[in-house]
Interface confidence: low
């Protein structure tokens, strides 16, 4: 079969599976005169043979792990054994079969993890090797936790990266691990080849012992601090400690107070820096932060609570310079005249603000002293001895001592004796007729004037008139304001009128006095009046159920996903058609009938979140009136942006020749959302060939150092590829290039002869 198994002498490559006994020839080479025989040389390992006539074969099974490629040469010889053709290279590639099991490098691993460590942050790696080809499933390893001991409530506290063998805490582990309850755990880890996907895979196991260490980065107990302290400040009130020495501490005042009376030193001790005043502020909440030497937060901030304890540093204060009460001539003994309510700025419901009231003076003392008494704790004034007579004494002045446990204050009360309230208010009309108004009449409009009169003493509580609507306005759409000089009542609109719910209202007014009527006198029909309010329909725009609708979705939702919905109703009951306005990115569509909102394009948090559009509800038919509301779509981040360099690093150079290895620092970033601790990138060289010349080392989550490994560089530009991984879910990797030039320098700058000015590096290292 010319071509497949036989042919002339030429360079050829053959692939043969390892571990298979020979079953057929590899190739039959044809000799062209004067060649008569063939010869085989190279990595034959006494396995590969060529017969004189050119038949190439192998005599026993191959082993890829011994040699993955056999480089052979075949030459054609003449009758005298002289090479007349060739030698030509013949390559035998040995194809892998799964004939090696994975093996852990250690039968037992030990590690430690701090409680409350960040979930997903590796604290230990297990490592296995497999001699099979890593480019095939035979050598692709898959790590798994077989068992966790102890297992509490069937919850896994640990997880393993199936590909890298990195062990970290789960979210539950981060929250629940506690060395006081359980200081150590054991994991059995398995590794399988075939990517863990085949029943025929080989496996190995190892044991991992994990010690849980205490996390001392904990919020301290709430602190109580007595106000107006006279001790020398600052005073230490509490402390926080990072788990390792060397952290940099700071306090964050989330309330942005005009003065923030706390500080922290580099030991983590927290101080109050000046006396506190409970009456100014009775409690403080602020945060303690620990950062590394580069200013990156080491962990979440701790909440510090300070409660300010009260002392009695405020005297009672009177409600006003003079408090005025009225009492009718005929009022009976024990009747309440009014309550004096003094204030005390000290803490409520404590002895420091608990007040006592005592009458210290009555003027005039006519017809006798002690006409009034005051309830010691309530401050309620009562008539103590007899009814008062206006013609004898129209006014009394009382001096009342109000005291807390340390302070006394004098308050002044004026008691006016007024005529008895024996006349009821009488409406000038019992029926104010009909009034027709459109439902869109402005709030605040006066729609009706009513009038009642009262024959009691003018400008006292006996003759003052208060109007109440007692029927026909359960919604409270109307109110009545009274002119204190004329007792005229002005009926005003307090809330919008509504034809749809109240087209006709039969309103009933009652006119009353603030003072009680004398015994035996009662309000009668003269104190009541009515009127009928007729509301006419105005076509109104639809009304949305909310001013702003908000929804939250992940930025990677599939096109066509429902992301939210809006609702509106038309007061007249017409159907509504919904539409969108301001969808500048073309991301959304709305169902005209239901108000459901769907995505119609890929969403992108990094383009801006929340995404704000307007929704319009329009009447179908009628006047086609419409109203507008807001729809805010909050986009939750997914890890969809690979890391990149934070800025342009063109122009990096070293002066040639290097006198010593040099280094430079670069920064990475990505556009995804990073929580309090910021990104946690890992850095490595982009290809193996760079490792002889360069080294990359991580400084912190965002910065790394690129260093030269030696000084023997040529005078030219090198492009160093760097792999940056964000460790997200899923992890994304970016490969970036740092161009570094080695050049002759003059006074620390790159020197270029005239005519070679393009791309001059500008930053020396």
């Amino acid at each position: 079969q010319e071509g497949k198994f036989s042919g002339p002498l030429k360079p050829m490559t053959f692939s043969i599976y390892e571990g298979q006994e020979p079953s057929q020839i590899i190739f039959q080479f044809k000799a062209n005169p004067p060649a008569v025989t063939f010869e085989l040389t190279g990595e034959t390992d006494n396995i590969f043979v060529i017969e004189r006539e050119g038949l190439l074969y192998y005599n026993r099974a191959l082993d890829r792990e011994t040699r993955s490629t056999h480089n052979l040469q075949v030459a054609a010889l003449d009758a005298n054994g002289i090479i007349v053709e060739g030698p030509v290279p013949i390559t035998i590639k040995v194809k892998d079969i799964n004939d090696n099991r994975p093996t852990f490098l250690q039968s037992k691993y030990e590690g430690s993890v701090r409680q409350n460590s960040r979930p997903g942050k590796p604290f230990l790696y297990v490592n296995a090797t497999d001699l099979d080809d890593p480019a095939t499933p035979n050598g692709q390893l898959y790590y798994q936790i077989v068992i966790q001991l102890p297992m509490i409530n069937n919850v896994m506290y640990f997880q393993i990266n199936n590909k890298t063998g990195a062990i970290s805490l789960t979210r539950e582990g981060s929250q629940e691990l506690n060395p006081a309850k359980n200081p150590s755990y054991n994991l059995v880890i398995s590794v399988k080849d075939m990517g863990g996907q085949s029943e025929n895979s080989f496996s190995d196991t190892t044991s991992v012992d994990i010690i849980v260490t205490e996390n001392i980065w904990k919020a301290p107990k709430p602190v109580e601090m007595v106000e107006n302290s006279t001790d020398p400040h600052p005073i230490k009130i509490t402390q926080v400690r990072w788990n390792d020495p060397g952290a940099q501490y700071s306090l964050v005042d989330k309330e942005k107070l005009p003065r923030f009376p706390f500080s922290i030193d580099q030991e983590g001790d927290i101080y109050v820096t000046q006396p506190l005043d409970r009456e100014e502020k009775d409690a403080y909440v602020f945060y303690a932060v620990a950062k590394d030497e580069y200013g990156k937060p080491l962990s979440y901030p701790l909440e510090i609570h300070v409660k300010v304890k009260d002392i009695n540093d405020n005297p009672p204060t009177c409600p006003s310079p003079v408090t005025v009460f009225e009492v009718q001539e005929n009022e009976r003994l024990g009747n309440s005249i009014g309550t004096l309510t003094a204030h005390d700025r000290d803490e409520e419901n404590t002895a420091n603000s608990f007040l006592n009231y005592r009458i210290v003076e009555q003027t005039p003392k006519l017809p006798m002293d002690g006409l009034f008494l005051i309830q010691t704790y309530a401050g309620m004034l009562q008539l103590a001895k007899q009814s008062l007579k206006k013609q004898d004494t129209p006014q009394y002045n009382l001096t009342i001592e109000v005291s807390d446990k340390d302070f006394k204050t004098l308050c002044f009360v004026q008691i006016n004796v007024i005529d008895i309230n024996d006349q009821i208010p009488i409406f000038e009309k019992s029926d104010y007729g009909n009034l027709t108004l459109a439902e869109d009449t402005n709030i605040g409009s006066t729609i009706l004037t009513i009038q009642a009169t009262d024959a009691d003493e003018p400008f006292t509580g006996s003759s003052k008139i208060l109007y109440h609507i007692i029927k026909g306005d359960s919604e409270g759409r109307l109110g009545v304001d009274t002119d204190p000089h004329t007792n005229t009542g002005y009926v005003i609109i307090k809330k919008p009128l509504d034809f749809e719910t109240a087209a006709v209202s039969n309103i009933v007014f009652k006119a009353e006095n603030p003072e009680p009527l004398v015994f035996g006198v009662k309000y009668n029909a003269s104190s009541f009046a009515k009127f009928t309010l007729i509301v006419t329909d105005v076509n109104e725009a639809p009304q949305f159920s909310q001013h702003v609708f908000q929804a939250k979705v992940s930025e990677d939702v599939a096109i066509g996903t429902k992301v939210g919905n809006v609702t509106a109703k038309d007061p007249e009951g017409l159907d509504i058609s919904y539409s969108l306005r301001g969808d500048t990115r073309g991301w959304l569509k709305i169902d005209h009938v239901t108000g459901e909102i769907f995505s119609v394009a890929p969403l992108d948090r990094e383009a801006g979140s929340p995404y704000r559009v307007q929704v319009v509800a329009t009447e179908v038919g009628g006047s086609s009136l419409s109203s507008v509301s807001e729809f805010h779509l909050i986009l939750m981040d997914v890890n969809d942006n690979p890391p990149r360099l934070a800025k342009d690093y063109t122009g990096l150079f070293f002066c040639h020749p290097l006198s010593a290895p040099g280094s430079l620092i670069f920064e990475a970033t990505d556009d995804d959302q990073h929580l309090f601790r910021g990104p946690h990138f890992t850095f490595s060289l982009g290809s193996g060939s760079l490792q002889n010349d360069w080294e990359v080392s991580k400084i912190n989550g965002t910065h790394a150092r690129l260093s030269t490994r030696h000084t023997e560089f040529e005078e030219r530009e090198y492009v160093v590829l760097i792999r940056i991984n964000d460790g997200g879910r899923p992890p994304l990797e970016g490969i970036v290039s740092l161009p570094v030039t080695f050049c002759s320098c003059v006074e620390g700058s790159c020197f270029r002869p005239a005519g070679h000015q393009t791309g001059i590096p500008t930053v020396g290292m």
Partner: nanobody
Amino acid sequence: QVQLQESGGGLVQPGGSTRLSCVSSRTFSYYDMGWFRQYPGKEREFVALLSWRGNYAEYSDSVMGRFVVSRGNTQNSVNLQMNNLKPEDTGIYYCAVTYGGARSVRLWGQGTQVTVSS
């Protein structure tokens, strides 16, 4: 009868300064003193407040950084230094005695006119 007496104000150029003073006929311990203003046809609005100890001041957003409220020579007086005045600062400025913040005024002054105009 306790009275509050304001002084100062008048006509001021835009960008200019003026100082208002207020004296109470009685000393109010534990009561705060401050200033409010009223535009024609509008309700009185809060401007600035000084705590009775004189150790804490509060300002409305519209005057923050331009006006400074301070204690006068006595416990029962309060000043308002008004800098970088704008036409919208025109109005009647009232001195007030309050208890427990700007919402509970216990006593009003008669008011003094400030007009900012070129």
